[in-house]
């Protein structure tokens, strides 16, 4: 079979490599006195999307309907990726993050062209919108770099609410003390394959 | 409601050329990835080739590798099948199909022929 | 290249159960959809990731993949389901489709 690839938003730096990156260029910043808060992010990153325990995320977007699947992916089947945008916090938070100087690291996250991961906190629910730029704070989410390669995503809308998994969906969950930061359903993979 | 218009078929000698359009309306085009899928007479169904982003992701079945080019044009919502060094064996019905779902970062065909269209015949014939 | 094998004809009296089954390599790795195609018409999807079915798809259709082998249940075939059903599969971007069966309801 003939195949053409060209991937948009290709990039070969891994997850720490960003880490490192932040820290490089808000240092850089700092010296030249220039703001590189919220307008546009400081860089992007193409992942997939799984569970603590190896679940895939699914993106099933039609125009008028969507359903996000948690499930084991067939051997023969590639994942779904998202488009993970990293902002710095327009907010310097007093809480333990993953940020620089006490600045917090937050990303959207979109699976595809113009729609990106929302924060609905009244029905704790996780849903897909279409929006244009600039985001409703609902697409921010404070990224928490956790043990064992693992993320989790912090709601920008209502702190102590992060993205996880409940009856094989989506879902946010409360998380009543630091202890329970470690809880295997509000962790997430992120690999570039 | 999902509509795609296949045209362009019609009788055309060994060696030949041809080009298929699908007109698309009901659904935001430019944000799936579409296929073409023909259908000799009497016969199954032959997938024979698929796009997803513009121009950038394009792939064809071995029969016809080389001799068929599959493009689109989001901003006319059309499909296109350019069919060159036509044979005998390409005569057919041509369906245009959507995927079922949008496309996605991870690139490629997802969950194809989820709607298809009425079918433009291709009789290739000396 | 792939290859998806289902039997050429079925037959099924009104109100019984009809399956149709599609084998393949390692079929189960991955996901199988189901085309109906009726004379002059063109195919329609029933099934698709194994077992889901889109809107407008009546229950009686059902659909299972495991093993080598996928395989599209119709439960109270009614008349109205005699057609072609064809298997499909996607492989490293490129479709792939099963020969077809005939659904015929005696």
């Known amino acids: 079979m003939h195949h053409h690839h060209h991937h948009h938003h290709h990039h070969a730096a891994g997850l720490n490599d960003i880490f490192e990156a932040q820290k490089i260029e808000w240092h850089e910043a700092a010296i030249e006195g220039r703001s590189i808060t919220g307008i546009s992010p400081i860089t992007e990153y193409l992942a997939s999307l799984s569970t603590y325990n190896d679940q895939s995320i699914t993106f099933a977007l039609e125009d008028e309907s969507y359903e996000i699947y948690v499930e084991d992916l067939k051997k023969d089947e590639k994942k779904d990726k998202v488009l993970l945008s990293y902002y710095e916090s327009q907010h310097p938070s007093n809480e333990s993050g993953d940020g620089v100087d006490g600045k917090m690291l937050m990303v959207t996250l979109s699976p595809t062209k113009d729609f990106w991961l929302h924060a609905n906190n009244k029905e704790h629910s996780v849903e897909l919108h279409k929006c244009e730029k600039p985001l409703p704070d609902q697409a921010f989410f404070v990224l928490h770099n956790m043990h064992s390669n693992c993320v989790s995503f912090e709601c920008k809308t209502d702190p102590g609410v992060f993205i996880g998994v409940k009856d094989n969906h989506l879902a946010l969950i409360k998380v009543d003390s630091s202890e329970n930061l470690c809880t295997e359903n509000i962790l997430f993979k992120l690999s570039e394959t | 409601e999902v509509q795609l218009l296949e045209s362009g078929g019609g009788l055309v000698q060994p060696g030949g050329s041809l080009r298929l359009s699908c007109a698309a309306s009901g659904f935001t085009f430019s944000s799936y990835a579409m296929s073409w899928v023909r259908q000799a007479p009497g016969k199954g169904l032959e997938w024979v080739s698929g796009i997803a982003d513009d121009f950038t992701s394009t792939y064809y079945a071995d029969p016809v590798k080389g001799r068929f080019t599959i493009s689109r044009d989001n901003s006319k919502n059309t499909l296109y099948l350019q069919m060159n060094s036509l044979r005998a064996e390409d005569t057919a019905v041509y369906y245009c199909?959507?995927?079922?779902?949008?496309?996605?970062?991870?690139?490629?065909?997802?969950?194809?022929?989820?709607?298809w269209g009425q079918g433009t015949m291709v009789t290739v014939s000396s | 290249s792939y290859v998806l094998t289902q039997p050429p004809s079925v037959s099924v009296s009104p109100g019984q159960t009809a399956s149709i089954t599609c084998s393949g390599e390692?079929?189960?790795?991955?996901?199988a959809a189901w085309y109906q195609q009726k004379p002059g018409q063109s195919p329609v999807l029933v099934i698709y990731r194994d077992t889901k079915r889109p809107s407008g798809i009546p229950e009686r259709f059902s659909g299972s993949n495991s093993g080598n082998t996928a395989t599209l249940t119709i439960s109270g075939t009614q008349a109205m389901d005699e057609a072609d059903y064809y298997c499909g599969v996607l492989k490293q971007d490129t479709g792939v489709f099963g020969g077809g069966t005939k659904l015929t309801v005696l």
């Open positions: 390692r079929m189960g790795d991955k996901y």
């Open positions: 199909a959507r995927d079922l779902w949008m496309m996605n970062y991870a690139g490629g065909l997802r969950y194809p022929f989820g709607y």
